[in-house]
Amino acid sequence: KIDACKRGDVTVKPSHVILLGSTVNITCSLKPRQGCFHYSRRNKLILYKFDRRINFHHGHSLNSQVTGLPLGTTLFVCKLACINSDEIQICGAEIFVGVAPEQPQNLSCIQKGEQGTVACTWERGRDTHLYTEYTLQLSGPKNLTWQKQCKDIYCDYLDFGINLTPESPESNFTAKVTAVNSLGSSSSLPSTFTFLDIVRPLPPWDIRIKFQKASVSRCTLYWRDEGLVLLNRLRYRPSNSRLWNMVNVTKAKGRHDLLDLKPFTEYEFQISSKLHLYKGSWSDWSESLRAQTPEEEPTGMLDVWYMKRHIDYSRQQISLFWKNLSVSEARGKILHYQVTLQELTGGKAMTQNITGHTSWTTVIPRTGNWAVAVSAANSKGSSLPTRINIMNLCEAGLLAPRQVSANSEGMDNILVTWQPPRKDPSAVQEYVVEWRELHPGGDTQVPLNWLRSRPYNVSALISENIKSYICYEIRVYALSGDQGGCSSILGNSKHKAPLSGPHINAITEEKGSILISWNSIPVQEQMGCLLHYRIYWKERDSNSQPQLCEIPYRVSQNSHPINSLQPRVTYVLWMTALTAAGESSHGNEREFCLQGKAN
């Protein structure tokens, strides 16, 4: 009933709660002397389903058979309509449509930790759309049965608040859940278990790691566990890895030695516990311990390369370059590099520690045979030194690689190819491909890059420190014993027409011809490797096509003569630059009038 129902009643048969698909009879009846004033025969009783009129009848009562009600709650209201007045509400009723509960499925119980309490979960099945009460029973030792009711609308979990203890770990407990509503009841299948089956240990805590004598090879992991734990799983990985190493241990008693850790590596460690070999479940993984392993002396050898530069008749500059060891080779923080320079015949040696750089430059006499050795040192020791004899890398013309080419290969890659030298190709022990940004001044401070290639290779893909729209000077060296030959080429990974033309800075007259001088285009405006310069000229105020002279690009060149100008004629001159992608815009314009005698 949803109203005071002073004027009449609404009755529902067979019940206010019905099974989906059932039929109900709804009767609305007026109480005595509650009809329309004077016109009781004109009483019009109307039945509403929510706000929709579904039936009406003249008289003191109305009967309606209703079918097809949906799941959930439906509201019926009975109203009285009299002539010349508003409808009056008589009474109403709610009908609840639902289904009997399905059998609860997958009942499972767990106790989290030895001090935890037993909690059970189950799957309710489809929604009954009715108030449904769940009762969980747990029977066990001492012939006791515990029972707890759940009155939540959607109940699929109950905690008994009982802490099972290991007094008799093999004792059986049986859980069962029963769902009851107005339309029926259903019980789950019983779930039988022992203490060892359902107690899930708490994850281990207080995890620590110790390295005896600061050595990675003598490492012990320590942790704390609940008292009954028998088994542990350890998993660990370098922090930058996704793959875990897994170890199972029995009766570890809170410690385990790890033998395969890499030095100077941050690891993540986690541990899980279990009470019994084949019963019960593993705990959650512990919180992670992150720890760095100690350093060990470096392994491997540095990759060393060098450049020689002639200074004057008696001196030469040697620039040494080396690559960082990989993390796995460095096995610690590299504190310094030790460079030893030695004159082989005189035996004089000079040693220097270099910090913060991977290069070193010195000046040595041009006479004598020189060798260098470079090693890397961390707190535990040094790598084996890399020894190289300083030689003239391009001296042996017959060892020079042939037909060197450099082609763009995708984004920021250059494919360098070559042919073996004419001299017996089998004499080549290795090729070195070297590249550096092309700077017109031949700046020795420009970083040098190189890679080594096996003697049977005739190509190399260079991608390290390659930028788009930058021209690189590329050299291929063939090394054989104490001899070397080299060839060079310019190359870029991506190019477009230069952004500007050269700037003419001077025009001078010399014996009837002129010499044009210009400033190089800034590197960032060249947009790749320059192939040519063009010098254009035409008579001032003339509409004729300009004449031009094309000059192959050479790094060091920044002047060129022109001898086809007429004396006492004023010319306008300008320059452009070309890459493989096209020609730049004009550089500045300069006027010039040749003063020499006419022919």
């Epitope: 066990g140 030792p141 006791l144 008994f160 608040g161 009982i162 099972l164 203890t165």
Partner: nanobody
Framework: QLQLVESGGGLVQAGGSLRLSCAAS????????MGWFRQAPGKEREFAAA????????IHADSVKGRLTISRDNAKNTVYLQMNSLKPEDTAVYYC???????????????????????WGQGTQVTVSS
């Protein structure tokens, strides 16, 4: 101090029903659980049923499960034992007991032990005739 008073006992025929009541008075705020025990002539006292005050969890001995049901009325600080389908072997003095242990009902093995309960009623006689 906490006092417990049982009522509702008497003589009943086999197959009949009785409802025992146990009213607590005094320091009732300290109650964490209440239970019913029974003692037949010439036998030891045995556990019948108990209820945890905080959440209404019930514990029944399997020997009475389905016939004897414990319930409570928090507002009245009263616990009931509804006894159905009574048998002559149900004849005994029925005692009400209470505990002020906040951990009551955490341990499976102590909930049915008399030592768990610190407060006891005088008992009410139930006689089932055949």
């Amino acid at each position: 101090q906490l006092q417990l008073v049982e009522s509702g006992g008497g003589l009943v025929q086999a197959g009949g029903s009785l409802r025992l009541s146990c009213a607590a008075s005094g320091r009732t705020f300290g109650i964490h659980g209440m239970g019913w025990f029974r003692q037949a002539p010439g036998k030891e006292r045995e556990f019948a049923a108990a209820i945890r005050w905080s959440d209404g969890t019930t514990i029944h001995a399997d020997s009475v499960k389905g016939r004897l049901t414990i319930s409570r009325d928090n507002a009245k600080n009263t616990v009931y034992l509804q006894m159905n389908s009574l048998k002559p072997e149900d004849t005994a003095v029925y005692y009400c007991a209470a505990t002020s242990n906040p951990q009551f009902g955490r341990n499976w093995y102590t909930v049915a032990a008399g030592v768990e309960y610190g407060y006891w009623g005088q008992g009410t006689q139930v006689t089932v005739s055949s």
